[in-house]
């Protein structure tokens, strides 16, 4: 007789989740020599330990501490790129500008990127059927708490000039409820971070507005200034050209505004 199982509103654990995490871990440690010492089996055990047999609405940052410890990684603190609602372009950028890092360029971010996971209280099983939705079910679910934890640590580590890529096509270019707005902004350390520089990415080809004057950007500037961190903002009118110029900065067309 099948056991009764809690039905959540969100999609279930990503298929082949354990094998995917292990494979990603192995690949990452092969590509990044400074992480060669990492034992991926231990990483998986710690990851699993954070949510297996626990109620998926009762996960805490503390649950992820063993994983955080195993995934400890030093990235150049002045080369951090945050992003909000524009992940693909941010990742394309760091793939070209290899000395800059998004959270997903770190081991823990790379492991979990685009994956969903949850368990069930009092059983050792992974729930492939459904997982809690942040809005409809609960915010203290395994995925949300993971990203809150790693995002906080990533922001805390940042120094000097921190860059953030924002999506200029959205109604709220800066969204206080995003991970960037609710976690990262508040965990930048004013004693280490001098400036937050926002890159507002334009969507439309003919869009020549100065989106740095958007009310939500002004709101971001106000929050940052109150935290004794300087704020600057740049419009990226042509993201395709922007990427091309990062690849080939010598190109003659790259001297004009992008």
């Amino acid at each position: 007789v099948p056991r009764w199982r809690q039905q959540w509103s969100g999609p279930g654990t990503t298929k082949r989740f354990p094998e995917t995490v292990l494979a990603r871990c192995v690949k990452y440690t092969e590509i990044h020599p400074e992480m060669r010492h990492v034992d991926c089996q231990s990483v998986w055990d710690a990851f699993k330990g954070a949510f297996i047999s626990k109620h998926p609405c009762n996960i805490t940052e503390e649950d992820y501490q063993p994983l955080m410890k195993l995934g400890t990684q030093t990235v150049p603190c002045n080369k951090i790129l945050l992003w909000s609602r524009i992940k693909d372009l941010a990742h394309q950028f760091t793939q070209v500008q290899r000395d800059m890092f998004t959270l997903e360029d770190t081991l823990l971010g790379y492991l979990a990127d685009d994956l969903t996971w949850c368990g069930e209280f009092n059983t050792s099983k992974i729930n492939y059927q459904s997982c809690p939705d942040w809005r409809k079910d609960c915010s203290n679910n395994p995925v949300s708490v993971f990203w809150k934890t790693v995002s906080r640590r990533f922001a805390e580590a940042a120094c000097d000039v921190v860059h953030v890529m924002l999506n200029g096509s959205r109604s709220k270019i800066f969204d206080k409820n995003s991970t960037f707005g609710s976690v990262e902004v508040h965990n930048l350390q004013p004693e280490k971070v001098q400036t937050l520089e926002a890159w507002v990415i334009h969507g439309g080809r003919e869009d020549s507005r100065d989106l740095c004057q958007d009310p939500t950007i002004k709101e971001l500037e106000s929050i940052i200034s109150k935290r004794n961190i300087q704020f600057s903002c740049k419009n990226i009118y042509r993201p395709d050209k922007f990427l091309q110029c990062v690849k080939n900065p010598e190109d003659s067309s790259c001297t004009s505004e992008i």
Epitope: R16, E19, L22, A23, V26, K27, K125, I126, Y128
Partner: antibody, heavy 121, light 110 residues
Framework: EVQLLESGGGLVQPGGSLRLSCAAS????????MSWVRQAPGKGLEWVSE?????????YYADSVKGRFIISRDNSKNTLYLQMNSLRAEDTAVYYC?????????????WGQGTTVTVSS | QSVLTQPPSASGTPGQRVTISCSGS????????VSWYQQLPGTAPKLLIY???HRPSGVPDRFSGSKSGTSASLAISGLQSEDEADYYC???????????FGGGTKLTVL
Amino acid sequence: EVQLLESGGGLVQPGGSLRLSCAASGFTFDDYVMSWVRQAPGKGLEWVSEISESDGSNKYYADSVKGRFIISRDNSKNTLYLQMNSLRAEDTAVYYCARLEPEKYYGMDVWGQGTTVTVSS
Amino acid sequence: QSVLTQPPSASGTPGQRVTISCSGSNSNIGNNLVSWYQQLPGTAPKLLIYRHDHRPSGVPDRFSGSKSGTSASLAISGLQSEDEADYYCATWDDSLNGRAFGGGTKLTVL
């Protein structure tokens, strides 16, 4: 002792059906992803199908058997199944079940002895 | 036709070192975990190498695995007559959404 034991093979006519079973013992069966692999006479290994651990909700099939074979598991009986329908001559092979071990990064660390399926008129 | 390409045969004399290659792509070897299997005549396959380069207990250290980019290889040093068998590489393939075995390499000890 950790063991897998296949059964259910035999001679069947083209278009016919057969159900293979794989009885597991010596380990917690529902903790493991399980797989079927076959080997045609004188040929190499060919992966056939795979089922996820616990409730077996995730199932995968090789293109050559998709729509004809169904993998399932009964954790209460510690048994893996392969229901084979619309059998063809090219399905003739020794069929092995195998366990995928997470501790060995999903290598197939335990195999059954195999059961022979012959499709012929 | 397998998405993982192995040489159909390899040979060596006792004591020699032989290497068997397994060539794939980003959708399989490039992004996934490689294992190697040994199949002695008339027997079920046996796990020889997992995670590209790890040996299960009981497998002699004469067997070693490696991976580089989208290729993997199995090396057998100090070849012995009992190593005469078929060898298969295997991994998950993201494009097929299934597992894949190489075509197999028949190793002959001369």
